[in-house]
């Protein structure tokens, strides 16, 4: 494939990354398909400066990110290491409740309305940002 | 009411240490970061450092790092800041502040406490 | 790190009148600019956050408006409790700056 060089239409270029915001609600795993679907990924939050950014285009609105911790330790989709990386949680957050009634416990991380972080039920229909990196190779075959 | 009380200023030598406290009351401590800001006299407002509201994560300024630590003990309510190899030029008020979690602006601040270092 | 510039650094001004102080960024910050007033021998006073959101408890003759670079701090009409030191900070990418203040006082 070809090294994408700018954003597609409607995403927005920030740092070597195009982010999109969605203005919907879907379940994290919905989330996460369809950014793949558009060879991207739930966004990765990996300084001060991408967390302001996001924060300025979501606003005061529950929107998830691409980490979880479903199969145990939270984990970043891309891989980015989650232990050394920029971490932002809520005050006494995450802290995998069960009280919600709704089975099991939270293992889909959010931006809340301040912007930081908590852990809450996969399955609740927030709004999402998918990110891709500029530098990374597209999947489409180049022009001929 | 939201108070910041600065504590632990005063003539220090260059090159020697001090530690400054910041005693917080009137909303809860443990769930906001803190900053500490300082001002050289007749001079304008320099950001020093920020911590999160557990203290897992820290930013310090340039003219700063690697010589002052900043920390907190959500126990006793209180922020601090560390200040080793002192310089003249480290003279100033400093002020502990308050952050708003969404902004990061400073919305709450201490009256200041003046530290000197002069031989 | 982000450079902040406030201009003019000092103006003298008569109660009534309306003053603006502008800030620039030496790069984008979106939206996070905030404005402290300052008097002598006090600790400085938030005033407007977020470029335009005015403080809790701080009179409406205050405003503030820009986004990106560029950032206006308004004082409709001056008033004696006014006169002061105004500063701009920067809180998008740490190291968080402060512009070098401007000082309003007396015509």
């Known amino acids: 494939g070809s090294e994408r060089t700018c954003c597609p239409v409607n995403w927005v270029e920030h740092e070597r990354s195009c982010y999109w915001f969605s203005r919907s609600g879907k379940a994290w795993a919905d989330a996460d398909n369809y950014c793949r679907l558009e060879d991207a990924h739930l966004v990765v939050v990996t300084s001060w400066e991408e967390q302001k950014f996001v924060q300025h285009h979501i606003g005061p609105v529950n929107t998830w990110m691409g980490l979880h911790d479903q199969n145990g330790p939270w984990k970043w989709v891309d891989g980015t290491d989650y232990e050394t990386g920029f971490k932002n949680w809520r005050p006494e957050q995450p802290d995998d409740w069960y009280g919600h009634g709704l089975g099991g416990g939270e293992d889909c991380a959010h931006f809340t309305d301040d912007g930081r972080w908590n852990d809450d039920v996969c399955q609740r229909p927030y709004r999402w940002v998918c990110e891709t990196e500029l530098d990374k190779a597209s999947q489409e075959p180049p022009l001929l | 009411q939201v108070q910041l009380v600065e504590s632990g200023g005063g003539v220090v030598q260059p090159g020697r240490s001090l530690r400054l406290s910041c005693a917080a009351s009137?909303?809860?401590?443990?769930?906001?970061?803190m900053h500490w800001v300082r001002q050289a006299p007749g001079k304008g407002l320099e950001w020093v450092a920020v911590i999160w509201h557990d203290g897992s994560d820290k930013y310090y300024a340039d003219s700063v790092k690697g010589r002052f630590t900043i920390s907190r003990d959500n126990s006793k309510n209180t922020l601090y800041l560390q200040m080793n190899s002192l310089r003249a030029e480290d003279t100033a008020v400093y002020y502990c502040a308050r952050e708003d979690p969404r902004t990061s602006c400073s919305d709450y601040w201490g009256q200041g406490t003046l530290v000197t270092v002069s031989s | 790190d982000i450079q902040m510039t406030q201009s003019p650094s000092s103006l003298s001004a008569s109660v009534g009148d309306r003053v603006t102080i502008t800030c620039r960024a030496s790069?984008?910050?979106?939206?996070?600019l905030n404005w402290y007033q300052q008097k002598p021998g006090k600790a400085p006073k938030l005033l407007i956050f977020a470029a335009s959101s005015l403080q809790s408890g701080v009179p409406s003759r205050f405003s503030g408006s820009g986004s990106g670079t560029d950032f206006t701090l308004t004082i409709s009409s001056l008033q004696p409790e006014d006169f002061a030191t105004y500063y701009c900070q920067q809180t998008y990418s740490v190291p968080f700056t402060f512009g070098p203040g401007t000082k309003v006082d007396f015509k």
């Open positions: 009137g909303f809860t401590f443990s769930s906001y970061g």
């Open positions: 790069q984008n910050i979106f939206s996070y």
